[in-house]
């Protein structure tokens, strides 16, 4: 096998299907974030989730490392007709890609969106949401995926999660 | 041009137009994988397609060097819509990625999904699904695609399409 | 901090909420793509958008160096749904990236559509489209992005974005 | 508070009919779909039919198209289910239940097919 | 059409003990299940939704989970008012399909 160089920076991780816990409260540090902070991501599931030269921290990835990352994100929105009264047919899903760095506020990356189907004849709705993209972060950055409409996140290690690597 | 180390370990295989021969039978060797495997990808479309220090089989990409692999595929749904007798036949479009290792049964990595609209003003409907994350993989894996209501894929070459490549 | 080896060949470049002059005119040199070409990336917002190695011209990334790039993008549609009489309120959202060589004429690498709500009760539509994959690309390639429905496009420096970056 | 409330039930000869009503409350009926389920005595649940909240789509199975008919007025919050040509093997108690997930269910009514 | 093949069909247990009920879909459901319990005489009640959801009211020794196309009830201590017939429900496409129903008696 050829030398390959430095060892990786890189992370994979994933959801945990347990649902409490998974979302920061809205009062939490991170407030002038859109959305909710999903919180417990899981990184050491043999073959599905890691950490190499990454932290993991109350949900964030912490940067060891100078350069440029990809960072990317899929959450995977599930719902269903409830009947639930004073509820909008209407759901926005939104997910954000933010970044921590010595700026008291979180900056905004990236945000991908879609809305629900109008329909009054819809039973259900299935969504994922995928985002990636390349950016310049620093040592001890700490980056975080928020979500609107939290509840309907399926947590499946499949299915939502949260990744990086540095790119060179 | 400055030297740029080892060669790379690559690949992006995309869709071929004719339908026939693209999945396999449900009764072939992923009959526990969820949905039909897409077979019949292109690795040597000029410009388009390629592989370099990967193996295309049977549908599935084989890797030979071990080490993290950013992994990620498209796939687009195309279809008119067919009101039958005040039927509505919805769809859940869903993409998954599988590996298999020395395990017998195939390891999903990553699900995407999508269902269609279900409003009676329905005429068609056009579903990109992409996903990709990174992975561990190791000399001999192989990782495949498949997806649920296979007969609405669009195998255009730019449409639907599957890669990966080494990371570090 | 170990060494990194060569410098990097990366961009991430991105919308400029000014909708003006974002795209071309339809008559353009790129009137053999579908779509209308996104002319107006911002490259130097800091911690936002970046050019390393690599150029930007007329909304246009030129290749510096040859070799496989991981090329994608990120569009974000959004509207209010207007009542017509007896009009159609679908419509298509599709994402082309395409590469311009010595060949005259651009040559499509990636397409990723969505179709929009069909129903009567629909108010307003969020629709992000995203796609990426991997291709070769020589010296002085041009790779681009066009849209269909160009004037949806949100173009939040978050929300639609273009990048690659060199992978090995 | 959510209610379903089944009538309509009773004997009927092979080869007749009968409609079942579900009056519905607690809830905005309109924006709902609806179903019918029943269960044979000592059988498991089985799903008879489906009308979605805007009352654009009906569902059957296979084994009942042509012979039930699901149906809705919105104004009167109510649901329907009309069934022709009954069998012995239709006897059942009769369940509506709401939405399509089926959260909410009546106490059902009691269908008896025989001569 | 989707198939639900629950297990077991019958049930001895005492109370406090732990109980699991399964429900295998023949296909990819999307998580669209819900479990249900019939008393005789009772309205029927559904427990939990979308695989692991607790409906409201619902106690939380039940719980749901979902491991591909195998869903769990789990009950965590058997309590009298628990015995009752269980039933999960797919309802990611029709036709609707019921599993066969497990009766939980007491031992």
């Known amino acids: 096998v050829r030398e390959r160089g430095p060892q990786r920076v890189a992370a994979h991780i994933t959801g945990t299907r347990g649902r409490s816990n998974t979302l920061s409260s809205p009062n939490s540090k991170n407030e002038k974030a859109l959305g909710r902070k999903i919180n417990s991501w899981e990184s050491s599931r043999s073959g599905h989730s890691f950490l190499s030269n990454l932290h993991l921290r109350n949900g964030e990835l912490v940067i060891q490392e100078k350069g440029f990352y990809y960072i990317y994100s899929q959450t995977y929105f599930r719902f269903q007709e409830e009947i639930k009264e004073n509820t909008k047919n209407d759901k926005q899903m939104v997910q954000y890609i933010y970044k921590y760095t010595s700026y008291p506020d979180p900056i905004l990356l990236m945000k991908s969106a879609r809305n629900s189907c109008w329909s009054k004849d819809a039973e259900y709705g299935l969504y994922s949401i995928y985002q990636g993209g390349l950016f310049e972060l620093k040592k001890d950055d700490r980056i975080f995926v928020s979500v609107t409409n939290e509840h309907l996140i399926d947590m499946d290690h499949e299915a939502s999660f949260f990744g990086a690597f540095l790119v060179g | 041009v400055r030297e740029r180390g080892p060669q790379r370990v690559a690949a992006h295989i995309t869709g071929t137009r004719g339908r026939s021969n693209t999945l396999s039978s449900p009764n072939s060797k992923n009959e526990k994988a969820l949905g039909r495997k897409i077979n019949s990808w292109e690795s040597s479309r000029s410009g388009h397609s390629f592989l370099s220090n990967l193996h295309l089989r049977n549908g599935e990409l084989v890797i030979q060097e071990k080490g993290f692999y950013y992994i990620y595929s498209q796939t687009y749904f195309r279809f008119q819509e067919e009101i039958k007798e005040n039927t509505k036949n919805d769809k859940q479009m869903v993409q998954y990625i599988y590996k298999y290792t020395s395990y017998p049964d195939p390891i999903l990595l990553m699900k995407s999904a999508r269902n269609s609209c279900w409003s009676k003003d329905a005429e068609y409907g056009l579903y990109s699904i992409y996903q990709g994350g990174l992975f561990e993989l190791k000399k001999d894996d192989r990782i495949f695609v498949s997806v649920t209501n296979e007969h609405l894929i669009d195998m255009d070459h730019e449409a639907s399409f599957f890669g990966a490549f080494l990371v570090g | 901090v170990r060494e990194r080896g060569p410098q990097r060949v990366a961009a991430h470049i991105t919308g400029t909420r000014g909708r003006s002059n974002t795209l071309s005119s339809p008559n353009s040199k790129n009137e053999k793509a579908l779509g209308r070409k996104i002319n107006s990336w911002e490259s130097s917002r800091s911690g936002h958008s970046f050019l390393s190695n690599l150029h930007l011209r007329n909304g246009e990334l030129v290749i510096q160096e040859k070799g496989f790039y991981y090329i994608y993008s990120q569009t974000y549609f959004r509207f209010q749904e207007e009542i017509k009489e007896n009009t159609k309120n679908d419509k298509q959202m599709v994402q082309y990236i395409y590469k311009y060589t010595s060949y005259p004429d651009p040559i499509l690498l990636m397409k990723s559509a969505r179709n929009s709500c069909w129903s009567k009760d629909a108010e307003y539509g969020l629709y992000s489209i995203y796609q990426g994959g991997l291709f070769e690309l020589k010296k002085d390639d041009r790779i681009f992005v066009s849209v269909t429905n160009e004037h949806l496009i949100d173009m939040d420096h978050e929300a639609s974005f273009f990048g690659a970056f060199l992978v090995g | 508070e959510v209610q379903l409330v089944e009538s309509g039930g009773g004997l009927v000869q092979p080869g007749g009919s009968l409609r079942l009503s579900c009056a519905a409350s607690?809830?905005?009926?309109?924006?709902?779909?609806m179903s019918w389920v029943r269960q044979a005595p000592g059988k498991r649940l089985e799903w008879v039919a489906t009308i979605s909240g805007g009352g654009s789509y009906t569902y059957y199975p296979d084994n009942l198209k042509g012979r039930f008919t699901i149906s809705r007025d919105n104004a009167k919050n109510s649901l329907y289910l009309q069934m022709n040509s009954l069998r012995a093997e239709d006897t059942a108690v009769y369940y509506c239940a709401a939405p399509t997930a089926m959260d909410y269910w009546g106490q059902g009514t009691l269908v008896t097919v025989s001569s | 059409d989707i198939q639900l093949t629950q297990s077991p069909s019958f049930l001895s247990a005492s109370v406090g003990d732990r109980v699991t009920i399964t429900c295998r879909a023949s296909q990819e459901i999307s998580g669209f299940l819900s479990w249900l319990q019939q008393k005789p005489g009772k309205t029927i009640k559904r427990l939990i939704y979308a695989a692991s959801t607790l409906d409201s009211g619902v106690p939380s020794r039940f719980s749901g989970s979902r491991s591909g196309t195998e869903y769990t009830l789990t009950i965590s201590s058997l309590q009298p008012e628990d015995f009752a017939t269980y039933y999960c429900l797919q309802y990611a496409s029709y036709p609707r399909t019921f599993g066969g129903g497990t009766k939980v008696e007491i031992k």
């Open positions: 607690g809830f905005t009926f309109s924006n709902y779909g």
